[in-house]
């Protein structure tokens, strides 16, 4: 007869490991007992369980409530056991010793490998600002057994570098993603992808890039100067900029306070019916935590050509 077993049994942390040991013998042969032991290079052989043909399974104190026979139907020649809820410390070499009648004793060894799936974590780097050189955007760390693979999935141009730290029963892998920040990256996804034999599918953690910037300011509303005449209603100036974080806007008049009735509403300066007093230099101030910008325009309110009191007699003038 001979023992049918497996050189390597692989199980994911927390799952049940079936340690196989089946005696393939002649029809008249019987298995008396199967002794299971843990073989440790430092501690030697430690008994794990004894499976007796007549009296069932008796388990070592260290494995109480953790070792069972596989569920029925059971073959009397099958000495396999189930190791419940495998933990990392269970990884190692196991031995089954089968006592048969009349053929004698047989033994076989197998290695139990416990896969520890990683629980990845993503840590954003320091705040990104346009104008910086090569900067850490994010780092991603995953620890498992065996060592996981950590890569990045993104449309953003950058460089990635990895390093790993070996522990007694696992390895931690950290991958960093560096880039030169630009405003076009703002809102772009940066995804850490972790692969491991203990995972059914890759684990993905996405970080949305935030690049601080502040665009130059400009003012819209003076495209047609002829519209800025006395009496016109609803005249506005709008300050144009963009930034991350979103900027705050403020309006001032260079040559004095804002005329009465002129209202500031965010990026927009609203005028009451225009008078010549509204002429002047207006400054739009844009700022966020990163920077501040300004843009100024000169408003010249023209006299209303239809106002007879202000009409010029061209004939007499000539």
């Amino acid at each position: 007869g001979e023992l049918e077993t497996s050189d390597l049994v692989t199980v994911v942390l927390g799952q049940d490991a079936k340690l196989p040991c089946f005696y393939r013998g002649d029809p008249d042969e019987q298995v008396g007992q199967v002794a299971w032991a843990r073989v440790d290079p430092n501690e030697g052989t430690r008994e794990l369980a004894l499976l007796h043909s007549k009296y069932g399974l008796h388990v070592s104190p260290a494995y109480e409530d953790r070792v069972e026979q596989p569920p029925p139907p059971r073959d009397p020649l099958d000495g396999s056991i189930l190791l419940r809820n495998a933990v990392q410390a269970d990884e190692g070499e196991y031995e089954c010793r089968v006592s048969t009648f009349p053929a004698g004793s047989f033994q076989a060894r197998m290695r139990l490998r416990v896969l520890v799936p990683p629980l990845p974590s993503l840590n954003p780097g320091p705040p990104l600002e346009e104008g910086q050189g090569l900067t850490l955007a994010a780092s991603c760390t995953a620890e498992g057994s065996p060592a996981p693979s950590v890569t990045w999935d993104t449309e953003v141009k950058g460089t990635q570098s990895s390093r790993s730290f070996k522990h007694s029963r696992s390895a931690a892998v950290t991958s960093e993603f560096h880039l030169v920040p630009s405003r076009s990256m703002n809102g772009q996804p940066l995804t850490c992808v972790v692969s491991h034999p203990g995972l059914l599918q890759d684990q993905r953690i996405t970080h949305t890039l935030q690049v601080a910037f502040l665009a130059e300011a400009s003012v819209r509303g003076l495209e047609d100067q002829n519209l800025w005449h006395v009496g016109r209603e609803g005249a506005t100036l709008k300050c144009l900029s963009e930034g991350q974080p979103p900027p705050k806007y403020n309006w001032t008049r260079l040559d004095g306070p804002l005329p009465s009735g002129v209202r500031v509403k965010g990026d927009t300066l609203g005028f009451p019916p225009l008078t010549t007093e509204h002429s002047g230099v207006y400054v739009c101030h844009v700022s966020n935590e990163l920077s501040s910008r300004a843009s100024q325009v000169t408003v010249e309110v023209l006299a209303d050509p239809e106002d007879p009191g202000k009409q010029v007699d061209l004939v007499s003038a000539s």
Epitope: A35, E47, L50, K54, Y55, H58, S60, P61, A62, E64
Partner: antibody, heavy 122, light 111 residues
């Protein structure tokens, strides 16, 4: 060699408690269960309970439940059995015994302590 | 009153063969292994037979064990004076969830 060495004889008054120790040597202490068995003068053997030396989990005979406490100290490979509310009929030799035979995990006691005589008398 | 029943005493002449019986039920002997212990006067018990019929190393093969149904027996052949002792059978009891012992049998070697 494998052995269990117990503490010395004790004399106790009724109602008191006694704590008997059993120090293991010559084998991996946490690998085998330890049982406690007692024998009253001129009487047979009586099983009291079992302790898992690695987890400290215990199970005792119904007769002793609530009165017997089994503990262990893995740092010294020692098991303790404390019996409370002693009465005269608890006068007996108390034995600790290692489960297993020649390293195999069998439900039999291959190594016994030398015994500790506990006398309960007023 | 012990869960397992043994005769209180047996006696036989030297060089003869003696048998000690042990009777139980399906929850102990019927379903579990039987062990036999020898206790010499003033000494701790010693394992003699385990798992019905197996001898620990160092035990003389003059001792043998057997089991049938809910009964077990210990046989000692070629009796010697040093075999004079108390003999106990024991088994795990599934109902009581603990070990049970027989009341013990005192063996006297005559002559």
């Amino acid at each position: 060699q494998v052995q269990l060495v117990q503490s010395g004889a004790e004399v106790k008054k009724p109602g008191a408690s006694v704590k008997v120790s059993c120090k293991a040597s010559g084998y991996t202490f946490t690998s085998y269960y330890i049982h406690w068995v007692r024998q009253a003068p001129g009487q047979g053997l009586e099983w009291m309970g079992i302790i898992n030396p690695i987890s400290g989990r215990t199970s005792s005979a119904q007769k002793f439940q609530g009165r017997v406490t089994m503990t262990r100290d893995t740092s010294t490979s020692t098991v303790y059995m404390e019996l409370s509310s002693l009465r005269s009929e608890d006068t007996a030799v108390y034995y600790c015994a290692k489960e297993g035979v020649g390293g195999e995990l069998l439900r039999a006691f291959d190594i016994w302590g030398q015994g500790t005589l506990v006398t309960v008398s007023s | 009153q012990s869960v397992l029943t043994q005769p209180p005493s047996v006696s036989e002449a030297p060089r003869q063969r003696v048998t000690i019986s042990c009777s139980g039920s399906s929850s102990n002997i019927g379903n579990n292994a039987v062990n036999w212990y020898q206790q010499l006067p003033g000494k701790a018990p010693k394992l003699l037979i385990y798992y019905d019929d197996l001898l620990p190393s160092g035990v003389s093969d003059r001792f043998s064990g057997s089991k049938s149904g809910t009964s077990a027996s210990l046989a000692i052949s070629g009796l010697q004076s040093e075999d004079e002792a108390d003999y106990y059978c024991a088994a795990w009891d599934d109902s009581l969830n603990g070990f049970v012992f027989g009341g013990g049998t005192k063996l006297t070697v005559l002559g």
